[in-house]
């Protein structure tokens, strides 16, 4: 069985306030089964940004069609970026269970927010 890897290719992304940010994430295996979630920050204070198994998340859309049964692209777009959105975003694979348990995390992508051009 191929070991699942989570690839977040961008160490950092810079976006002007008011624009959309695309955060890339691909996985290398569908197994073990379980949802993908995105968080801003790490540890107990982290903030859930997107959860594959529940929604909606009004400002977040997936870049690819996640209803494809073979989909391995879980990149997201966050609209109308504000300074409050700055931080490091982690794409995390959970393994199914009661409750689902964290299986593997991407290395993270740091989002910085530039002032809106005047």
């Amino acid at each position: 069985e191929e070991e699942l890897q989570i690839i977040q290719p961008d160490k950092s992304v810079s976006v002007a306030a008011g624009e959309s940010a695309i955060l890339h994430c691909t996985i290398t295996s569908l197994f073990p089964v379980g949802p993908i979630q995105w968080f801003r920050g790490a540890g107990p204070a982290r903030v859930l940004i997107y959860n594959q198994r529940q929604g909606p998340f009004p400002r977040v859309t997936t870049v690819s069609e996640t209803t494809k049964r073979e989909n391995m692209d879980f990149s997201i777009s966050i609209s109308n970026i504000t300074p409050a959105d700055a931080g490091t975003y982690y794409c995390i694979k959970f393994r199914k269970g009661s409750p689902d348990t964290e299986f593997k995390s991407g290395a993270g992508t740091e989002l910085s927010v530039r002032a809106k051009p005047s």
Epitope: F31, P32, Q54, E65, E70
Partner: antibody
Framework: DVQLVESGGGVVRPGESLRLSCAAS????????MSWVRQAPGKGLEWLAG????????YYIDSVKGRFTISRDNSKNSLYLQMNSLTAEDTAVYYC???????????WGLGTLVTVSS | ALTQPASVSANPGETVKITCSGG??????YGWYQQKSPGSAPVTVI????KRPSDIPSRFSGSASGSAATLTITGVRVEDEAVYYC???????????FGAGTTLTVL
């Protein structure tokens, strides 16, 4: 409320074709994968085919591959099943079902009866 | 193939467990579907192993472990008489499979 209403069933002769429709309402149809499931008289449920939310990817059980085609028109909130070269073994009630994020089912239509008889 | 018992019976108020075996925990999610009469619309009572739709009574619960899933009805009622189908989605094959169904009789 989520509603799925199948239509297009009826009596056909062996070798003929039929197109089933499923009209969806009460949810954002274009965001969900969909499936067709059938039940032959006195038998259990049998999954036939699934389609991704955008319609680009389709999946079939081996026994209908090449004879049945699943498709959708998101502008009309409709799901279809084109059935060709029908045989008596295709006699069944055909249900459309909405898929969950992990390709199980949460909502079902009432079904439409297809009878193949000479 | 998913295997489930052909029939189970219980008295009102008892706890019923219906098992479904044959899937792979690593790659399979399970669901449970209730059909009160042949040809009538199935009703989803559990999906994603253990998730109960909001309109399904709390006496229905689901679990999965190893190669099997279990539907539990705690305090079964006469109106729970039905055929219960388990289904699995296998991420290796992209295919959904149903068990043959279990007829629940409430005595």
């Amino acid at each position: 409320d989520v509603q799925l209403v199948e239509s297009g069933g009826g009596v056909v002769r062996p070798g003929e074709s039929l197109r089933l429709s499923c009209a969806a309402s009460g949810f954002t149809f274009s965001s969900y994968a969909m499936s067709w499931v059938r039940q032959a008289p006195g038998k259990g449920l049998e999954w036939l085919a699934g389609i991704s939310a955008g319609g680009s990817d389709t999946y079939y059980i081996d026994s209908v591959k090449g004879r049945f085609t699943i498709s959708r028109d998101n502008s009309k909130n409709s799901l279809y099943l084109q059935m060709n070269s029908l045989t008596a073994e295709d006699t069944a009630v055909y249900y459309c079902a909405r898929e969950t994020w992990n390709h199980l089912f949460d909502y079902w239509g009432l079904g439409t009866l297809v009878t193949v008889s000479s | 193939a998913l295997t489930q018992p052909a029939s189970v019976s219980a008295n009102p108020g008892e706890t019923v467990k219906i098992t479904c075996s044959g899937g792979d925990w690593y790659s399979t999610y399970y669901g449970w579907y209730q059909q009160k009469s042949p040809g009538s619309a199935p009703v989803t009572v559990i999906h994603s192993d253990d998730k109960r739709p909001s309109d399904i009574p709390s006496r229905f619960s689901g679990s999965a472990s190893g190669s099997a899933a279990t539907l539990t009805i705690t305090g079964v009622r006469v109106e729970d008489e039905a055929v219960y189908y388990c289904a699995g989605y296998d991420g290796r094959t992209y295919i959904n499979t149903f068990g043959a169904g279990t007829t629940l009789t409430v005595l």
